[in-house]
Interface confidence: medium
């Protein structure tokens, strides 16, 4: 229904302290490079705005969209050109088009310093002083460098982090407490991250028809004893809530997921046997519950899938007759019937049957063309399956860090070309894949590993995209979104790229990476040899693994020497006239 | 949960015409694939029609084609089978069947519908 003042509406419905921090998280994002008192002071200005539209919603401006009120505020922030240069530019647009101006100026890598986590003394000091303040900064960090994070998803993992500093701030030993729990909320975070990226990539490159198809499959898999109306249903709503998320519309958004969340807990009967212990939580813990939700049973007595689409002799009138209800019929079969296939490979499978129907039902015998179509499902699965097994095979070999080596070199091979940065970047992601599903059990593991990779490749193509480099990479990214990880699987060796000069500098090291993190540490020596792939593109296992293990030897020996300035003159020209041999 | 509920049968002269009536409670018939299926004497379940659920496509066995019209009236809830031109081998026990959630494929397979009337009998004879 329409209401007088959309701002009082979402005022209401979403209350005084989720209101602040949506509006906190959609500056930030709009906005990356602004100081947090800069948001906040306008987060404070929207909100006693809104309160007076909640008093009287025919006060002056109360009427105007949400995007209105907003883009308003940020276009009223002095020095907006000198800090921000064309953005600048949206400003002169009229909505809609200054909305989109915006979004289009999101970057997705901004030029901002890692975040760094505060000693847990100081952290617990500022957390109890101001509690409000320290999530508004959690908050405010957090959207600026993900400028597509799912708003509601933020204030979910802010509620989390508030929660362990509660817990581990009355500690005698805060670090031991506050680490490992912090360290688990950090990696589902950035987990959900690049998720929600590819949701934003789906829904910007190939619009609201394949985002359906995404959570028609989904849906199916989690819920197999829902009909197709309810899955539907369903689908249709998580469209429109991620629609409004990516979009900007953050209010809209977690409002409407919230309200989906009301109406699957009360409608558990036709959806899943498996909702109540999620519906008697808080809002934001029941929406993320219902999330991340476990599959509930499949029916014991379903038929075969090939009864309704392949035997019937209707199926090209069925086809022909209504599209895309028929397509997302076959999709919600198959999808409810595998919850051990990845997202990706059902919708391959499903392009697979469309592709089959729409030349045999051309043809003279359209059941003898099509009679054959799911056999041919087969290689489509077997490709999937055979990727996990090497890869956690590997990875059970080599453990985390030496499969993200692995991945490293072989990705740093097909694409040359990418910075070095990107490539480490996601190569450590990609390598992560591992701990993350290769334990877990079998029927498990491919929709972990597939859905994860085509996630973190994601983006790869995002960031690619903005300096394109590789004609390879640019092909992969072009192309279908499910048909991005067997492309980039597919694709070996760049036999055009001219290896890279020998820089001594670049494997030049000081003592100070002595006293680095490990995972500063890692990302050193990652660096390194992605560079000497790079100068030797075509070097063997056996080399690399000479050289890895010289330079290990060498930073090891170094920062246990006496004089380690001295250690790292020394010895490391001959570590680089060594490795310049070993690869020759 | 479906019942079913089917009423108009009887006993009607070559030639005749009689409309077949199939109540639905429970849910919403125009959210579910509904047909008409029929059973003779000592012989298998046919299909006789069907319709899709929320789309009006509707499907003949070629026996029937031009003689039978299916349709329903979501209002009423109801599903109903219009039989002109009444040959004697349209003599049967008429059944309605449902299998709820299913846009478009109305499935000639009787094994496929997991809901079912208790069936009304059409005589054919002079």
């Known amino acids: 229904e329409a209401h007088k003042s959309e701002i009082a509406h979402r005022f209401k419905d979403l209350g005084e302290q989720h209101f602040k921090g949506l509006v906190l998280i959609a500056f930030s994002q709009y906005l990356q490079k602004c100081p947090y008192e800069e948001h906040i002071k306008l987060v404070q200005e929207v909100t006693d705005f809104a309160k007076t539209c909640v008093a009287d919603e025919n006060a002056e401006n109360c009427d105007k969209s949400i995007h209105t009120l907003f883009g308003d505020k940020l276009c009223a922030i002095p020095k907006l050109r000198d800090n921000y240069g064309e953005l600048a530019d949206c400003c002169a647009k009229q909505e809609p088009e200054r909305n989109e101006c915006f979004l289009q100026h999101k970057d997705d890598n901004p030029n901002l310093p890692p975040f760094q986590r505060p000693e847990a003394e100081a952290m617990c000091t500022s957390f109890q002083e101001n509690p409000t303040s320290f999530l508004g900064h959690y908050l405010h960090e957090v959207a600026r460098r993900h400028p597509y994070f799912y708003a509601p998803e933020l204030l979910y993992y802010a509620e989390k982090y508030n929660e362990v500093l509660t817990q581990c701030c009355t500690e005698s030993d805060k670090a031991a407490c506050l680490t490992p729990k912090l360290d688990a909320v950090k990696e589902k975070a950035l987990v959900a991250a690049v998720r929600q990226r590819m949701k934003c990539s789906s829904m910007q490159r190939f619009g609201e028809r394949a985002f359906k198809a995404w959570a028609v499959a989904r849906m199916s898999q989690r819920f197999p004893n829902a009909e197709f109306a309810e899955i539907t249903k369903l689908a249709t709503d998580v469209t429109k809530i991620n629609k409004e998320c990516c979009h900007g519309d953050l209010l809209e958004c977690a409002d409407d997921r919230a309200e989906l969340a009301k109406y699957m807990c009360e409608n558990q009967a036709t959806i899943s046997s498996k909702l109540q212990a999620c519906c008697d939580k808080p809002v934001l813990q029941k929406s993320q519950c219902l999330a991340e939700i476990e599959h509930d049973n499949i029916p014991a007595d379903l038929p075969s899938i090939a009864a309704d689409f392949v035997e019937d002799k209707e199926v090209c009138k069925n086809y022909a007759e209504a599209k895309d209800v028929f397509l997302g019929t076959f999709l919600y079969e198959y999808s409810r019937r595998h919850p051990d296939y990845s997202v990706s490979l059902l919708l391959r499978l499903a392009k697979k049957y469309e592709a089959t129907l729409e030349k045999c039902c051309a043809e003279g015998d359209p059941p003898a063309c099509y009679g054959t179509v799911l056999a041919e499902f087969q290689p489509l699965v077997e490709e999937p399956k055979n990727l996990v097994k090497t890869n956690c095979e590997l990875y059970e070999k080599l453990g985390e860090y030496g499969f993200q080596n692995a991945v490293l070199v072989r990705y740093t091979q097909k694409a040359p070309q990418v910075s070095t940065p990107t490539l480490v970047e996601a190569a450590r992601n990609l390598g992560r894949v591992g701990t993350k599903c290769c334990t877990l059990p079998e029927a498990q593991r491919l929709p972990c590993v597939e859905d994860y990779l085509s996630a973190i490749l994601n983006r790869l193509c995002v960031l690619h995209e903005k300096t394109p480099v590789s004609e390879k990479v640019t092909k992969c990214c072009s192309g279908s979104l499910v048909e991005r990880r067997p492309c980039f699987s597919a694709l070996t060796v760049d036999e055009t790229y001219v290896p890279k000069e020998f820089k001594a500098e670049t494997f030049t090291f000081h003592s100070d990476i002595c006293t680095l993190p490990d995972k500063e540490k890692q990302i050193k020596k990652q660096t390194a040899l992605a560079e000497l792939v790079k100068h030797k593109p075509k070097a063997t296992e056996d080399q690399l693994k000479t050289v890895m293990g010289d330079f290990a030897q060498f930073v090891d020996k170094c920062c246990k020497a006496a004089d380690k300035d001295n250690c790292f003159a020394t010895e490391g020209p001959n570590l680089v006239a060594r490795s310049k041999e070993a690869l020759a | 949960e479906v019942q079913l509920l089917e009423s108009g049968g009887g006993l009607v002269q070559p030639g005749g015409s009689l409309r077949l009536s199939c109540a639905a409670s429970g849910r919403y018939i125009d959210e579910t694939a509904v047909a008409w299926f029929r059973q003779a004497p000592g012989k298998e379940r046919e299909f006789v029609a069907g319709?899709?659920?929320?789309?009006?496509?509707?499907y003949y066995a070629d026996s029937v084609k031009g003689r039978f019209t299916i349709s329903r009236d979501n209002s009423k809830n109801t599903l109903y089978l219009q039989m002109n031109s009444l040959r004697p081998e349209d003599t049967a026990v008429y059944y309605c069947a449902a299998r709820p959630g299913r846009p478009l494929i109305t499935s000639k397979v009787a094994d496929l519908y997991p809901y079912w009337g208790q069936g009304t009998l059409v005589t054919v004879s002079s």
């Open positions: 319709i899709g659920g929320g789309v009006d496509i509707t």
